[in-house]
């Protein structure tokens, strides 16, 4: 996360942002918090983006003021108005696009003073993989599928039993471009698997890391999956 302090005027307030990632075609959140003020009408929130002439969003006197908003953000932004009073200046961004990536600044004015902090926003695509027994294969195989990734990720298989094993020789991964010509479907097949072993399919790019686990026994199939956004360090 990044903490910024106001440098102009008599007083400065602490503003904190969290570097985050947006999944294209979905809602995104640009996170920003500040020292609260007791009077909503005294709070001004301005979101700016480097290289963009107009404002991304402005909230003042208790409501949105979009008179100086840049066209590329028209109808796509909102603050959480009921949470501004408690110091939440986070911005909701509709229909995240690749072009939304960049450096944003959250600038705050309250009766206590001014402050700002920068935020690096990455955009791409990421999704949770689903691992299944591959019924099409001649030998016992696992199939790991994730519908949307961008940029192209790496795929690594791992086993709970043989933790240091390299499965690249016994797996095959393909990337299929989705109809919108940006994101790709990831499919990876792991061959010659043994039962009563937990296998993990790990998909990772510079934005996110997702894992799909599967354990096949004689009586059941257990699955588990999770997704983690890779936030970069504060600068």
């Amino acid at each position: 996360f990044i903490i910024g302090f106001g440098i102009s005027g008599r007083h400065s307030i602490t503003v904190t942002t969290l570097t985050s990632a947006g999944n294209i075609g979905e809602d995104g959140i640009l996170s920003c918090t500040f020292e609260p003020d007791i009077k909503l009408s005294d709070i001004v929130i301005q979101w700016l983006k480097e290289g963009v002439t107009g404002l991304v969003h402005e909230f003042k006197k208790g409501k949105d003021d979009l008179s100086d908003q840049d066209e590329m953000f028209r109808g796509r932004t909102a603050v959480f108005a009921d949470q501004v009073i408690v110091g939440n200046a986070s911005l909701r961004l509709k229909n995240v696009q690749l072009t939304d990536a960049g450096t944003y600044k959250c600038y705050i004015i309250t009766s206590k003073g001014k402050g700002n902090a920068k935020l690096e926003y990455k955009t791409g695509a990421f999704s949770i993989p689903e691992v299944n027994v591959d019924s099409n294969a001649s030998s016992e195989s696992l199939r790991c599928e994730a519908p949307r990734w961008f940029p192209q990720p790496t795929v690594v298989w791992a086993s709970q039993v043989d933790q240091g094993a390299n499965f690249s020789e016994v797996s095959n991964t393909s990337f299929e471009l989705n109809p919108e010509n940006v994101t790709m479907k990831v499919v990876s097949v792991l061959y010659n698997v043994t039962i009563n072993t937990t296998y993990s399919c790990m998909i990772e790019n510079d934005i996110a890391k997702a894992t799909g686990d599967i354990r096949v026994t004689d009586s059941e199939i257990k699955r588990q999956s999770h997704l983690q956004l890779l936030n970069s360090k504060a600068s």
């Epitope: 109808g75 909701r92 229909n95 994101t183």
Partner: antibody, heavy 121, light 107 residues
Amino acid sequence: EVQLVQSGAEVKKPGASVKVSCKASGYTFTSYWIGWVRQAPGQGLEWIGDIYPGGGYTNYNEKFKGRVTITRDTSTSTAYLELSSLRSEDTAVYYCARLDGSSYRGAMDSWGQGTLVTVSS
Amino acid sequence: DIQMTQSPSSLSASVGDRVTITCKASQGFNKYVAWYQQKPGKAPKLLIYYTSTLQPGVPSRFSGSGSGRDYTLTISSLQPEDFATYYCLQYGNLLYAFGQGTKVEIK
């Protein structure tokens, strides 16, 4: 409670114009987009366009560009749809609807009762 | 402009049936698909938005799913009050677009 109350039915001649009003109450009028949708008899829903009352920004369906104007009066919390050069195929029920999500253009979550516009010579 | 192709245009079903209606976007991808129910002489009612989020007060038998270009509205067990016309709406882009509608009738 969010309420959108539309003006009454209209009968117009081909080539004329019609202006339908939509008075909003129960929320901050300037903070939410308002959209307009029409439905011809026995037909489906057709999006016409929308307006952000806080700034007067508009978006229009290409099909209606040049014939439709969406405006608002913030002092009375009223949005207006004006359609010119009317033809018989403009006969429809016209709905206004509030878009969810404040300044963010969301789905239409609250609707007016509809205004029937009949175009007949 | 994005077009939404909805199918079927009509269907006959009985109370208790599972009903599925689909919408296919002509291009692009985003989660901004909503579903509406409309009864004769009434304004549409929002059921689901953002692909799968149920509008407050809407019964849980209604559900939405989908990704990419394909979206689905499912009624798990059709009730007498569910006989109506259903529309999908794409609202992710600058220009919004409705599907053509699906009329759900009593078999």
